[in-house]
């Protein structure tokens, strides 16, 4: 009794593919040095029709050799998952019936090298090149299997992708589209205006494709992507015009269009009546000479920061600007100030601004309940990390400009709405984290006694915002509690 | 009794694919130096119709060879997960039924090398190129299998919620849809408008989950 789909029908995707993709993602950098070796392994073992099981069986076995590489535990864990998961799942899917699998010890050296070098001399990189290719092939082969075994309602009709949308922050760039596939799969291609098409995310059932490693090659180029739709289980079959259906994306110029990520205040230092505030220079995925460039490296003087600052005791804000990552501002002696920064690219006409950084304040003494609030913030960060890989499109009531006299009311709304995230994620660790956070927050709130606030907005009167903005505003209000605890 | 989905129904995506994707992500840079090697493994082992299991079985086994490379522990852990997970999951899916699995010690050398050189001589880069390709092939092959394992089950029309409407874009299994409060009503804070098309394992019948939504004036 082998229910591949299991309880909610996503076993393969949620385990094996996640590991494969994480491995491949961690190997993004590998490739440019691989000298396009033709590995014989892939000549002899091909994920061909009726041979997918055998290919995957061999590839999974091959993967095990890499487990003894001196790599990080995380990487090994994924390799183990892909290798073992493939082997297990193969038994379940029956794709290798009647085949005699290959013996396990055999390796896959390259043709040219095998003629004249001992393996010990071979660069580590070459192993990684092979490993990356092996992972890619395993992924492709699984995709091929999993597309092919779905029962169809007697039709190979495909639907063209639509609503192709670029989602890009600090050059991390993902193409998203609709619809969720039913009996079809997608492959994405990307090119510059003058370049060749490069295929990515082969035969995927996802409705997004990470194109970061393509666009970071030249962020000032304009890119176009297209999404091909294929019938599940019959990727060779084409549309009526003799080629698969596809839809083009809007053009995308990363330098002009990537969203600016939320900045972070790295430090502030007071000397007399001057305070020096430093903004963290965030690393991007853009590379030059084998190093990742920072946001400032990429944008230079095109990027400016706006600082908002105010006395902890009042709400009247002041502002300053810099085209470096440092501000030097005048403050009143003996006063504590709070700071928030925003990144801006003045030369742009859209996507000019980032969201505001979390608020940082001077002289935050550890009050009795400050520790609780600090833990609430770390729980919120944890929730933010956990939901990143999920597609929760909920909008939540969010108070983004909390007046100090309404902070308890606002906090209660945040705590209520947090439960929606818990409900919709269906994830045990999110559920536990939310539960823990609510307990911590309620403990701290009860320490204020029964505060009655009047003239404050009901939760339902607040603006609904996406989860990211909701969590950012939540962090802001917690900072407010920290500053006054 | 092989419940691939595991306890929380996301076993494959959250374990195997996560590892595959993490490995591939860490190998992003690998490729441009790979000189478009045509690895024989992928010529001999193809994730073809009705052969997906064997391909994955071999690919998982092949992955194990990389565990001995001098890479980071993190990388190895993912490799181990992909290799072992594939093996385990293959047993579960029945994709290798009736096949004689390979003996554990056998590796997959390329044609020319196996004739005259030991594996030790092979450049590490080349191995990585191969590994990356192997992971990609395993991932694709799994996708191919797993897309085919569930017949197209759909949900009936969703239940009605007081003062709310729903426009269903897809009745397919695992579709997530939202109710919208009628004009003049707002979602009560703390309630969710989400409903999901899920499968009742006992009856094998799909149904929409009950939303916690309350619409208030």
């Amino acid at each position: 009794d082998c229910d591949i789909e299991g309880k909610d029908g996503k076993q393969y995707e949620s385990v094996l593919m996640v590991s494969i993709d994480q491995l491949l993602d961690s190997m993004k950098e590998i490739g440019s040095n691989c000298l396009n070796n033709e590995f014989n392994f892939f000549k002899r073992h091909i994920c061909d029709a009726n041979k997918e099981g055998m290919f995957l069986f061999r590839a999974a076995r091959k993967l095990r050799q890499f487990l003894k590489m001196n790599s990080t535990g995380d990487f090994d864990l994924h390799l183990l998952k892909v290798s073992e998961g493939t082997t297990i799942l193969l038994n379940c899917t029956g794709q290798v019936k009647g085949r005699k699998p290959a013996a396990l010890g055999e390796a896959q050296p390259t043709k040219s090298l095998e003629e004249n070098k001992s393996l010990k001399e071979q660069k580590k990189l070459n192993d990684l090149c092979f490993l990356k290719r092996l992972l890619q092939e395993i992924k492709t082969c699984w995709n091929k299997i999993l597309m092919g075994t779905k029962e169809h309602s007697g039709t190979t009709n495909t639907v063209a992708a639509y609503n192709l949308t670029w989602k890009s922050t600090n050059f991390k760039t993902i193409l998203e589209w609709e619809p969720k596939p039913v009996n079809q799969v997608y492959t994405v291609q990307i090119s510059t205006k003058s370049g060749d098409w490069k295929s990515k995310c082969f035969y995927t059932t996802d409705t997004e494709c990470d194109l970061t490693d393509e666009i970071v090659k030249d962020v000032k180029q304009t890119y176009l992507a297209r999404v091909f739709s294929y019938p599940a289980g019959n990727v060779e079959s084409t549309g009526s015009a003799g080629e698969p259906l596809y839809e083009n994306s809007p053009e995308f110029t990363p330098y002009l269009e990537t969203n600016l990520g939320q900045p972070t205040i790295q430090s502030f230092e007071q000397v007399g009546t001057k305070v020096n505030v430093t903004v963290e220079d965030e690393r991007t995925l853009v590379r030059r000479n084998n190093t990742f460039l920072s946001l400032r490296d990429v944008f230079g003087k095109d990027l400016i920061y706006t600082l908002y600052y105010w006395k902890s005791s009042s709400s009247g804000k002041k502002t300053a600007k810099t085209n470096t990552n440092e501000f030097l501002i005048d403050v009143d002696k003996g006063e504590n100030y709070c700071f928030s920064v925003q990144a801006v690219i003045p030369s742009r006409t859209v996507n000019r601004k980032s969201t505001d950084s979390p608020v940082e304040c001077m002289g935050q003494e550890k009050g009795e309940f400050r520790e609780n609030w600090v833990n609430v913030i770390s729980d919120l960060k944890k929730i933010e990390d956990l939901i990143q890989s999920m597609h929760i499109d909920a909008t939540l009531y969010t108070e983004s400009d909390v007046h100090p006299s309404c902070k308890v009311t606002a906090m209660k709304c945040f705590l209520l709405e947090l439960q929606v995230i818990s409900l919709e994620s269906g994830d045990a660790s999110i559920h536990d984290t939310v539960e823990n956070l609510i307990i911590l927050a309620n403990n701290s709130l009860s320490s204020n006694g029964n505060v009655t606030e009047s003239g404050c907005k009901e939760c339902e009167e607040l603006e609904e915002k996406n989860i990211k903005e909701f969590l950012q505003s939540f962090v802001h209000i917690v900072q407010m509690f920290i500053n006054t605890s | 009794d092989c419940d691939i989905e595991g306890k929380d129904g996301k076993q494959y995506e959250s374990v195997l694919m996560v590892s595959i994707d993490q490995l591939l992500d860490s190998m992003k840079e690998i490729g441009s130096n790979c000189l478009n090697n045509e690895f024989n493994f992928f010529k001999r082992h193809i994730c073809d119709a009705n052969k997906e299991g064997m391909f994955l079985f071999r690919a998982a086994r092949k992955l194990r060879q990389f565990l001995k490379m001098n890479s980071t522990g993190d990388f190895d852990l993912h490799l181990l997960k992909v290799s072992e997970g594939t093996t385990i999951l293959l047993n579960c899916t029945g994709q290798v039924k009736g096949r004689k699995p390979a003996a554990l010690g056998e590796a997959q050398p390329t044609k020319s090398l196996e004739e005259n050189k030991s594996l030790k001589e092979q450049k590490k880069l080349n191995d990585l190129c191969f590994l990356k390709r192997l992971l990609q092939e395993i991932k694709t092959c799994w996708n191919k299998i797993l897309m085919g394992t569930k017949e197209h089950i759909t949900c009936p029309p969703p239940m009605s919620v007081e003062h709310a409407d729903i426009w269903v874009k897809s009745y397919s299994l695992y579709s997530r849809e939202r109710y919208i409060c009628n004009s003049g009503f707002k979602r009560k804070a703390g309630t969710s408008s989400l409903t999901e098309c899920v499968l009742n394992k006992a009856t094998n019948v799909a149904h929409w989950t009950t939303p916690s939504l309350k619409c208030i004036r």
């Epitope: 300053a320 600007k321 742009r348 000019r352 601004k353 505001d356 400009d401 | -």
Partner: antibody, heavy 117, light 107 residues
């Protein structure tokens, strides 16, 4: 093309309030701050404050705190300035302008507010 | 607050003349300075931003220079339409103060 169109002139009695609007078109409203500037008869330009439609943050000159309140309506791409407790010295032309971070590149045509008993 | 001192307050010149107006900041503002022109009954119009950059559509006879605390604005050859009031503004830190203006009149 980019335009900032302000509401018409107003005559008010001392102690009253007035709301001046500034409707923006031809650009992404939330991407640019809206500045407000006063020019009293025969005088120079005085900066009142600005609002960032993206996050709702307002910054005021100390002299206008409590006098001016800046708001926006993102759905109509309109910025508003409310002046309260009007006095004769508030008689002036009030301008809104679009801030490109390094300067004010587009200005409204100005709204004359006259405070007279 | 940063004070902006503009000089001269008024200036008479003829068509074809070269004229320079200066603006002094009470503390360093790097190059966060803009220059505007205003004609009677009209809205101000941006001429120079970031101390030295010519705004779109502004004739090249206008130029700006300086950084830190000392700035100047020059019209290389006065045209009849250039007779107006000119303002500098610092956009470095709030309040974003203007200079008191320089009225340029026909001699």
């Amino acid at each position: 093309q980019i335009q900032l169109v302000q509401s018409g002139g107003e005559v008010k009695k001392p102690g009253a309030s007035v709301r001046v609007s500034c409707k923006a078109s031809g650009y992404s409203f939330t991407d640019y701050n809206v500045y407000w500037v006063r020019q009293s008869p025969g005088k120079g330009l005085e900066w009142i404050g600005y609002i960032d439609p993206y996050n709702g943050i307002t910054i005021y000159d100390q002299n206008f705190k409590g006098k001016a309140t800046l708001t926006v309506d993102k759905s109509t791409s309109t910025a508003y300035m409310e002046l309260s407790s009007l006095r004769s010295e508030d008689t002036a032309v009030y301008f809104c302008a679009r801030d490109v971070t390094t300067a004010l590149d587009f200005w409204g045509q100005g709204t004359t507010v006259t405070v007279s008993s | 607050d940063i004070q902006m001192t503009q000089s001269p307050a008024s200036l008479s010149a003829s068509v074809g003349d070269r004229v320079t107006i200066t603006c002094l900041a009470s503390q360093t503002i790097d190059t966060w300075l803009a220059w505007y022109l205003q004609k009677p009954g009209k809205s101000p119009q941006l001429l120079i931003y970031a101390a030295t950059n010519l705004a779109d559509g502004v004739p090249s006879r206008f130029s700006g220079s300086g950084s830190g605390t000392d700035f100047s604005f020059t019209i290389s050859s006065l045209q009849p339409e250039d007779f107006a009031t000119y303002y500098c503004q610092q956009v470095y830190s709030s309040p974003f103060t203007f200079g008191q203006g320089t009225k340029l009149e026909i001699k």
